[in-house]
């Protein structure tokens, strides 16, 4: 079967501030099995967005079903954005390991940029 | 706390319909997948049926086009329509959440169906 | 489908080390988890994702995976860790939920 690939079609998308971000990411399998993560940045500082398996993300929300047991898509929706959130953000597709899970394929990322509210 | 309370198991002929229903209480219901499991009597586990948060099904192939599993998000409660109901579908019917990979976190105490002519 | 095999029976003396194997299934498609269910009541998971213990499980529960073998190992087997212990798994292939037969533990 095709390896897995992790798709970000957008590679850049413009959102005025106070409004919601849309950004679209699919995989094109669901094997390996494991989480799905969203970061922004890339490299050991990266900073944690979303994580499919567990925590509290407030401002997040999930644009598809992710409970459906064949789903593919991962897109995440952003509130209320501020110029502090730009940058570019990776979705990241994991599989399963022990003690940990193991970063398996990234998308090549959305660079969000954050138009300033008319005055 | 996370409670899960089955209802609607009794004695019924072969043929005849149950619907079964699941109480839960102490976790957003809508954010949870759920699923179904049985257990006839001395035997051991098998998954029945699941259902994503949105309403999409699962089902084992055996009770395939004789089960219905659904939600009622707003009343908080999980159901299992059973219909042309066999001997084989004797057992305590568990419904269970799901964790986030479709694995099974919390159980409820079961809800015992016994088909018998 | 797959099915998933594990040992209908282990008996351990108290303070051992009881180690419970579970076979089948394919490691990049699978994740796996262990119930245990007591006489009479309803089953509780001790093990979930193949290693990962709920907060209110004891930790001389744990799990670990190898291939296409899983192992749910109890440290220091008490009395009351007397049970039927059952490996479940998901797979990604097939959306459906699997169990092993089950495994009686006996404590001596």
């Known amino acids: 079967e095709e390896e897995l690939q992790v798709i970000q079609p957008d590679k850049s998308v413009l959102v005025a501030a106070g409004e919601t971000a849309t950004l679209r990411c699919t995989a094109t399998s669901l094997i390996p099995v494991g989480p799905i993560q969203w970061f922004r940045g890339a490299g050991p500082g990266r900073e944690l967005i979303y994580n499919q398996k567990e925590g509290h993300f407030p401002r997040v929300t999930t644009v598809s079903d992710l409970t459906k047991r064949n789903n593919m898509d991962f897109s995440i929706r952003i509130g209320n954005i501020t110029p502090a959130d730009a940058g570019t953000y990776y979705c990241v597709k994991f599989r399963k390991g022990s003690p940990d899970d193991v970063e398996f394929k990234s998308g090549a990322g959305t660079e969000l940029s954050v138009r300033a509210k008319p005055s | 706390d996370v409670q899960l309370v089955e209802s609607g198991g009794g004695v019924v002929r072969p043929g005849e319909s149950l619907r079964l229903s699941c109480a839960v209480s102490?976790?957003?219901?809508?954010?949870?997948?759920m699923s179904w499991v049985r257990q006839a009597p001395g035997k051991g586990l098998e998954w029945v049926s699941g259902?994503?948060?949105?309403?999409?099904?699962y089902y084992v192939d055996s009770v395939k086009g004789r089960f219905t599993i659904s939600r009622d998000n707003s009343k908080n409660t999980l159901y299992l329509q059973v219909n042309s109901l066999t001997a084989e579908d004797t057992a305590i019917y568990y419904c269970?959440?799901?964790?986030?990979?479709?694995?099974?976190?919390?159980w409820g105490l079961g809800t015992l169906v016994t088909v018998s002519s | 489908s797959y099915e998933l095999t594990q040992p209908p029976s282990v008996s351990v003396s108290p303070g051992q080390t009881a180690r419970i194997t579970c076979s089948g299934g394919?490691?990049?498609?699978?994740?796996y988890a262990w119930y245990q269910q007591k006489p009479g009541q309803a089953p509780v998971t001790v093990i979930h994702?193949?290693?990962k213990r709920p907060s209110d499980i004891p930790e001389r529960f744990s799990g670990s995976s190898s291939g296409t073998t899983v192992t749910l190992t109890i440290s220091g087997v008490q009395a009351e860790d007397e049970a039927d212990y059952y490996c479940?798994?998901?797979?990604?292939?097939?959306?459906?939920?699997?169990f092993g037969g089950g495994t009686k533990l006996t404590v001596l």
């Open positions: 394919d490691y990049y498609s699978t994740y």
């Open positions: 994702s193949d290693d």
């Open positions: 259902i994503s948060s949105g309403g999409d099904t």
């Open positions: 269970a959440r799901e964790t986030w990979n479709h694995l099974f976190d919390y």
């Open positions: 102490g976790f957003r219901f809508s954010s949870y997948a």
């Open positions: 479940g798994g998901y797979d990604g292939r097939t959306y459906i939920n699997t």
